[in-house]
Interface confidence: low
Amino acid sequence: ILGGREAEAHARPYMASVQLNGAHLCGGVLVAEQWVLSAAHCLEDAADGKVQVLLGAHSLSQPEPSKRLYDVLRAVPHPDSQPDTIDHDLLLLQLSEKATLGPAVRPLPWQRVDRDVAPGTLCDVAGWGIVNHAGRRPDSLQHVLLPVLDRATCNRRTHHDGAITERLMCAESNRRDSCKGDSGGPLVCGGVLEGVVTSGSRVCGNRKKPGIYTRVASYAAWIDSVLA
C-alpha cells in the first residue's frame, strides 16, 4: 500500500495473507468459513511451493493470539483467467478446515448486485504489499482510502486505454495506491467487498495508471458455484 498508514490491529477480520513457502505472497479476503478469495495470478509462479493462508493477523512476524496459518485443500482459479491478461483474475482457496471465527477472524459480505460503485465513493484497500518504490515490505497491515474512478476516465488512452471491461473497476492512484504484494486483497466500499486487487505489473502511485480491481458482483455465479 502506497501513501497509506498502518491499519488498526484486527479491525479487518476478513483480511488474509496468502503465503508461499511461509512468506507473504498476496492478499486475500475471507468470504466464507472455509473459503478465501484472492487473485488468480498470485499462484502463477507457485509451482510446487506450499501455499497457505494466514488469518487473524496484523503483524506478519509477531505472535498474536488470533493468528492461525491454514493449509489449502483446493485452489480454484477462475477458468477464464490467463497469464497475460488482467481479466477474470480471481482465485478461490479452500482451507483445510473451517476457520475458527472470532473478533479477529470473520468473513466479509460481498456484493451480489451487479451495479457499478458510484465514482468518487471512498473505498478501503488493505494489504501487506510494498509501501515505497524501494520495495520496502511492511510487517503490519497497511490500508488506504481511495476514491472510485469512473470507467470512462480509466479507459482513456493515457490511462488504461480501453482495457477496463464492465467486470473491472478502477480507483484513483495519485500517490495513494495498492501495489506489489497487495494483489488479491479486498477493496471494501461501505462495509461490503466490491473488488479484488488485480495482480498485473501496473506501476503504483501513478496518477495516470489507476488501480484496477476485479468486480466481485460480476462473478457472483462463479463464486456461488465453487462455494456450493
Partner: antibody, heavy 125, light 107 residues
Framework: QVQVQESGPGLVKPSQTLSLTCTVS??????????WSWIRQPPGKGLEWMGD???????YYSPSLESRVTISRDTSKNQFSLQLSSVTAQDTAVYYC?????????????????WGQGTQVTVSS | SSALTQPSALSVSKGQTARITCQGN??????AHWYQQKTGQAPKLIVY???IRPSGIPERFSGSNSGGVATLTISGAQAEDEADYHC??????????FGGGTHLTVL
C-alpha cells in the same frame, strides 16, 4: 551532471511540420523515475507543457496539441524528438526540452530539474 | 486560460520581502514547484514539492502551499533576483501545467 540540448531549424513555413531533437548527456533517457519533456514559451508569454515521453517509451500529450504532436525517442543515441504538424504563426516560440523528475513512479508529472537552453522557432513564410 | 493564476508583475525594494502567489483549485491536491527565469535564459528550478530547495539555491527562497494558494517568498530580495517566476503543478487532467509567470522587479 545531466545536460540537455535542443537542436533543429529555427524557421518553419506555415502548414509544415516542425521537428526538433533533444540530446541528453550524463544520464540515460531510459532511467526509472524520469520522463523527458517538451515545453514551449511564446514571445512574452508563459510556459506551456507540450508532452512527455516516459522511461518505458509511453507518451503523454497536452490535450490542446494532441492531434498535432508526436514525441519519440532513440535510446541508442540517447535522444528524444518532437514533431508538431500543421504549424501556424501561433506556434512561434522558444522550445525547451527538459527532464521531468517523478517522485513516485516511472511516470508521474512532477517537476523539471534539468532544462535545455531553448531553441527559437519562428513560423513564417 | 491557465489552471494556475499568478500576478503578472510585482515590485519589491532591495532587501525587502517579495511574495509571489499562485492560485489554483487543485493545489490542495498537488504539489507546487517554482522556477526562476532570467532574461534570455532557460527556467531554473528553485523550489519543488511546495517548500524544498534544490542544492545551491539560496536560503532566502522559500515556498508554501495552503488553501489553494502556493506562495514563493524571497526574503531580502537582491538585484540578481530580478526575473520571471513560474509556478507549476498539475491540472484537472493530471497533466503538468504552468502559471502565467510573474515578473519581479527589484528596485
Amino acid at each position: 551532471q545531466v545536460q540537455v540540448q535542443e537542436s533543429g531549424p529555427g524557421l518553419v513555413k506555415p502548414s509544415q511540420t516542425l521537428s526538433l531533437t533533444c540530446t541528453v548527456s550524463g544520464g540515460s533517457i531510459s532511467t526509472s523515475y524520469y520522463a523527458w519533456s517538451w515545453i514551449r514559451q511564446p514571445p512574452g508569454k508563459g510556459l506551456e507543457w507540450m508532452g512527455d515521453i516516459a522511461n518505458d517509451g509511453s507518451t503523454y500529450y497536452s490535450p490542446s496539441l494532441e492531434s498535432r504532436v508526436t514525441i519519440s525517442r532513440d535510446t541508442s543515441k540517447n535522444q528524444f524528438s518532437l514533431q508538431l504538424s500543421s504549424v501556424t504563426a501561433q506556434d512561434t516560440a522558444v522550445y525547451y526540452c527538459a527532464r521531468l523528475r517523478s517522485l513516485y513512479t516511472d511516470y508521474d508529472p512532477h517537476y523539471y530539474d534539468y532544462w535545455g537552453q531553448g531553441t527559437q522557432v519562428t513560423v513564417s513564410s | 486560460s491557465s489552471a494556475l493564476t499568478q500576478p503578472s508583475a510585482l515590485s519589491v525594494s532591495k532587501g525587502q520581502t517579495a511574495r509571489i502567489t499562485c492560485q489554483g483549485n487543485l493545489l490542495p491536491r498537488h504539489y507546487a514547484h517554482w522556477y526562476q527565469q532570467k532574461t534570455g535564459q532557460a527556467p531554473k528550478l528553485i523550489v519543488y514539492d511546495d517548500n524544498i530547495r534544490p542544492s545551491g539555491i539560496p536560503e532566502r527562497f522559500s515556498g508554501s502551499n495552503s488553501g489553494g494558494v502556493a506562495t514563493l517568498t524571497i526574503s531580502g530580495a537582491q538585484a540578481e533576483d530580478e526575473a520571471d517566476y513560474h509556478c507549476q503543478s498539475a491540472d484537472s487532467n493530471d497533466d503538468a501545467v504552468f502559471g502565467g509567470g510573474t515578473h519581479l522587479t527589484v528596485l
